[in-house]
């Protein structure tokens, strides 16, 4: 703007105005007249850059005229009133409406005063995120998918995770002309450690007040990972019964547990109770390798544990308690 005291009339308008596809938008434009300055406005004109002629004119004696009367309207200019507000409303915004517009006041005696306004036509995208359920492949595969549908301009998609991973983003035209659908895949080598973890898809767009965050819970299908717990190498004759647990991680959940030994079926002192194995007291030393075989929809895996029951002073053991 000119410095105060120059006595000049100035057209005030934002340099850029956003509007949404299909909606209406007002292009604001005002004449600022210094206190002591006399000015007379005889005409308001709107023109689009690169096009001949005016799209909207408000003449002090003839009133308004429009190139498209159903889509344009002076919001404040009235016959018989001082013309100080040239703000123009546009209805049914189209992609092709995006561009530079000039708002011009014909003032006397100051002359023509104008300002340029850039109209941005936006479309607010719809965002979704979903898991891509995978099995152990040994190679990078898409594990999550984030889609921003029908944005203008295209949305920006980024992924946030402490698991690493690489994005693969692509764009295709949206359903509405001038819009874009952005798809981003989050790619990683699947592992059981990743199953159940979260990754976040962040979608940024001019139409959002703040970025949209969509969380995806990862799913990796894998066969059981098996271990046996409950044995501390300190079992002695004459102790009470003890319990071994077959610990299995898998997706989907295990469907069955089977206990055996390397010699075949379980000995009489070992009783299977699902994922647990009850070891009853014995009266002679043993050295047996126990096997827990766990099954899920993807297969079976097993773990082995060699158990020794030794002779020794009851007071010194730390395993199973004496009667």
């Amino acid at each position: 703007w000119p410095p105060p005291g120059t006595g000049d009339v100035v057209v005030q308008a934002p340099t850029q105005v956003p509007g949404f596809l299909g909606d209406s938008v007002t292009l604001p434009c005002y004449l600022q007249v210094p206190n002591m300055e006399v000015t007379h406005v005889s005409q308001l004109t709107w023109a689009r850059h690169g096009e001949s002629g005016s799209m909207a004119v408000f003449h002090q004696t003839q009133g308004p005229s429009y190139s498209e009367s159903k889509r344009l309207e002076f919001v404040a200019a009235r016959l018989g009133a001082e013309l100080r507000n040239a703000s123009l409303r546009m209805f049914g915004l189209r992609v092709e409406d995006e561009g530079n517009y000039t708002c011009l006041f014909v003032t006397f005696p100051q002359g023509s005063r104008s300002v340029d306004i850039w109209l941005r036509v936006l479309a607010k995208p719809q965002n979704t995120a979903e898991v891509q359920k995978v099995q152990l492949t040994g190679e990078p595969v898409p594990m999550a998918r984030c889609v921003s549908t029908g944005g203008r301009p295209p949305a920006q998609i980024t992924w946030h995770s402490d698991l690493g991973g690489m994005p693969n983003t692509s764009q295709v035209p949206g359903f509405l002309s001038g819009t874009v659908t952005v798809t981003s895949l989050w790619i990683l080598v699947p592992s059981s450690q990743v199953d159940g973890k979260n990754v976040t898809c962040k979608v940024e767009h001019e139409s959002f007040e703040k970025p949209q965050l969509l969380t995806v819970n990862l799913t990796v299908y894998y066969p059981p990972e098996v271990s046996i717990s409950g044995y501390d190498n300190n079992w002695y004759l004459g102790q009470n019964e003890a319990t071994l647990t077959c610990d299995a991680r898998s997706n989907p959940e295990p469907t069955g547990y089977n206990w055996s030994t390397t010699m075949g079926p379980l000995p009489p002192f070992a009783v299977a109770q699902g994922a647990q194995l009850l070891i009853r007291p014995v009266d002679k030393p043993i050295n047996t390798t126990l096997i827990c075989n766990v099954t899920n929809a993807l297969g079976a895996r097993q773990a082995e544990l060699t158990v020794q029951v030794k002779e020794g002073p009851p007071s010194e053991h730390s395993g199973i308690s004496r009667n």
Epitope: P2, T6, G7, D8, P34, M36, E37, V38, H40, S42, H59, Q60, T61, G80, V106, F108, P109, Q110, G111, S112, R113
Partner: antibody
Amino acid sequence: QVQLVQSGAEVKKPGASVKVSCKASGYTFTSSYISWVRQAPGQGLEWIAWIYAGTGDTNYNQKFTGRVTMTTDTSTSTAYMELRSLRSDDTAVYYCARHGMTGRGWYFAVWGQGTTVTVSS
Amino acid sequence: QAVVTQEPSLTVSPGGTVTLTCRSSTGAVTTSNLANWVQQKPGQAFRGLIGHTNNRAPGVPARFSGSLLGDKAALTLSGAQPEDEAEYYCILWYSNKFVFGGGTKLTVL
């Protein structure tokens, strides 16, 4: 061709009124701004007022406020300037001038031939 | 009350260049003063030459140009012709009124 033709010379007594006319041709009268200017004998030019012909909106030099009235008749494309309570120092040649636009600014484009007003007892 | 001052008279040789200036009693002349220049030849009506400081009117020869020169408005005539001999008036706008300069009598000799 744009022309402004003014009414003939007037002789008035002090305290009387005078109404000078300025007939326009060759352009759209209702879209024009017309100024009135005077030049007293041996003096410089003095701006009196302007009028927007389309609406009759006016702006007067404060020196003349209350004594001068500018009007237009769009049916005859004529502008009028009436000066009341005439004094001897109102003796002058009165001009109408149409403002035209050049580039993005206005200029004093076309002038009438002038009307001599003599105030004498 | 603003006073607009011009050189009372100037002389230029045919083909020569001359600059007429227009000073304001209120300070520097700026574009907000919308400087206008008009010409009056003896026995003829006034004719507008320049509007808005530097916009030449249609039909006015390119040898006439308007500008701001320091703190004054200026009319420069480059390549003066005998028919340019006339009285030249500067007009400045002061927020709510026009004020005329006293005029410069230009002689082409």
